[in-house]
Amino acid sequence: FERTRSLQDPCSNCPAGTFCDNNRNQICSPCPPNSFSSAGGQRTCDICRQCKGVFRTRKECSSTSNAECDCTPGFHCLGAGCSMCEQDCKQGQELTKKGCKDCCFGTFNDQKRGICRPWTNCSLDGKSVLVNGTKERDVVCGPSPADLSPGASSVTPPAPAREPGHSPQ
């Protein structure tokens, strides 16, 4: 069926970057400036996304692909395809509707985004605190107190290279 349709439908021959122009006898016309078609056989070209204001252009629009935006310094992307830019806060803070706010005692945020989270309660997982928490860092849990024999030294593990929230989707 698809093959039959493509033989009958001249628009199916129009490649990405063009559109099937009904006003010109269904000839494949190039997409006008600031528009694109990412698939073949399209009857219109889509308008290119414009990265304005707090958005900045990460990838220019071409005749076959939309522009991609990211955020200016001090902001980070939110949502699919960076649909929003959200203000960065400092580590040890969280973004509320009233702006950046310091984490309360007993909570931390090791990112420039996200919430202040309660320190991990090591004892709930049968462990002990190796390193105390701060506004910027969670506590580090170690072996249970019974596992630490006299004279045994406990070494603080290195901080992870990347924390949740910093990973690209």
């Epitope: 509707k97 919430i115 992870p160």
Partner: antibody, heavy 120, light 106 residues
Framework: QMQLVQSGAEVKKPGASVKVSCKAS????????MHWVRQAPGQGLEWMGW????????NYAQKFQGRVTITRDTSASTAYMELSSLRSEDTAVYYC?????????????WGQGTLVTVSS | SYELTQPPSVSVAPGKTARITCGGN??????VHWYQQKPGQAPVLVIY???DRPSGIPERFSGSNSGNTATLTISRVEAGDEADYYC?????????FGGGTQLTVL
């Protein structure tokens, strides 16, 4: 694409423990906190806790403290939720859910759920 | 602990507008997220940060939040919108869900 695939249904006796797994694919597991939420038959959603897959740091709802343990194996891109001292009221569908990036903590992707039945 | 209150059920005729409320003390200062759950399926995020839609969610779904009430609005309701809807917030140390609202399309 982004997927969370959970282990199969379980039937347990009261007093026993159950361990449910949640395998993440389509994204870097270390990049996002993982949560566990349960739903008893005909009831609403009830949050149980989270794990930071990077550090292993956890936070549990007060109701479950002492009975729940959330762990992870980043090499297998899998999170686990173990619930001990099971009682009939723990019969529920247990979901893992990835924390999103919105202000104020949303859960943007969910596993298909694992039915745990506690019955003598 | 923080509590969220939702009406147990809301009924609406196809093509009309459904409004589902979520009440909580000064909820307007918090970020509210909404989930849709159809029978036998996992919840799906339909609104985050009060009023933003994830990709793939129709524009018919919108949200607002001020004072002590957040609202999920579904315009031009379709039979496929029949489901349970849950609001959710983060409150200092725990994730809190509303009790859920069953939306019936008449």
């Amino acid at each position: 694409q982004m997927q969370l695939v959970q282990s199969g249904a379980e039937v347990k006796k009261p007093g026993a423990s159950v361990k449910v797994s949640c395998k993440a694919s389509g994204y870097l597991m270390q990049g996002y906190y993982m949560h566990w939420v349960r739903q008893a038959p005909g009831q609403g959603l009830e949050w149980m806790g989270w794990i930071n897959p990077n550090s292993g740091g956890t936070n549990y709802a007060q109701k479950f403290q002492g009975r729940v343990t959330i762990t992870r194996d980043t090499s297998a891109s899998t999170a686990y939720m173990e619930l001990s001292s099971l009682r009939s009221e723990d019969t529920a569908v247990y979901y893992c859910a990835r924390e999103g990036e919105a202000v104020g903590l949303d859960l943007d992707y969910w596993g298909q759920g694992t039915l745990v039945t506690v019955s003598s | 602990s923080y509590e969220l209150t939702q009406p147990p059920s809301v009924s609406v005729a196809p093509g009309k507008t459904a409004r589902i409320t979520c009440g909580g003390n000064n909820i307007g200062s918090k970020s509210v997220h909404w989930y849709q759950q159809k029978p036998g399926q996992a919840p799906v995020l339909v609104i985050y940060y009060d009023s933003d839609r994830p990709s793939g969610i129709p524009e018919r779904f919108s949200g607002s939040n001020s004072g002590n009430t957040a609202t999920l609005t579904i315009s031009r309701v379709e039979a496929g919108d029949e489901a349970d809807y849950y609001c959710q917030v983060w409150d200092s140390s725990s994730v809190v869900f509303g009790g859920g609202t069953q939306l019936t399309v008449l």
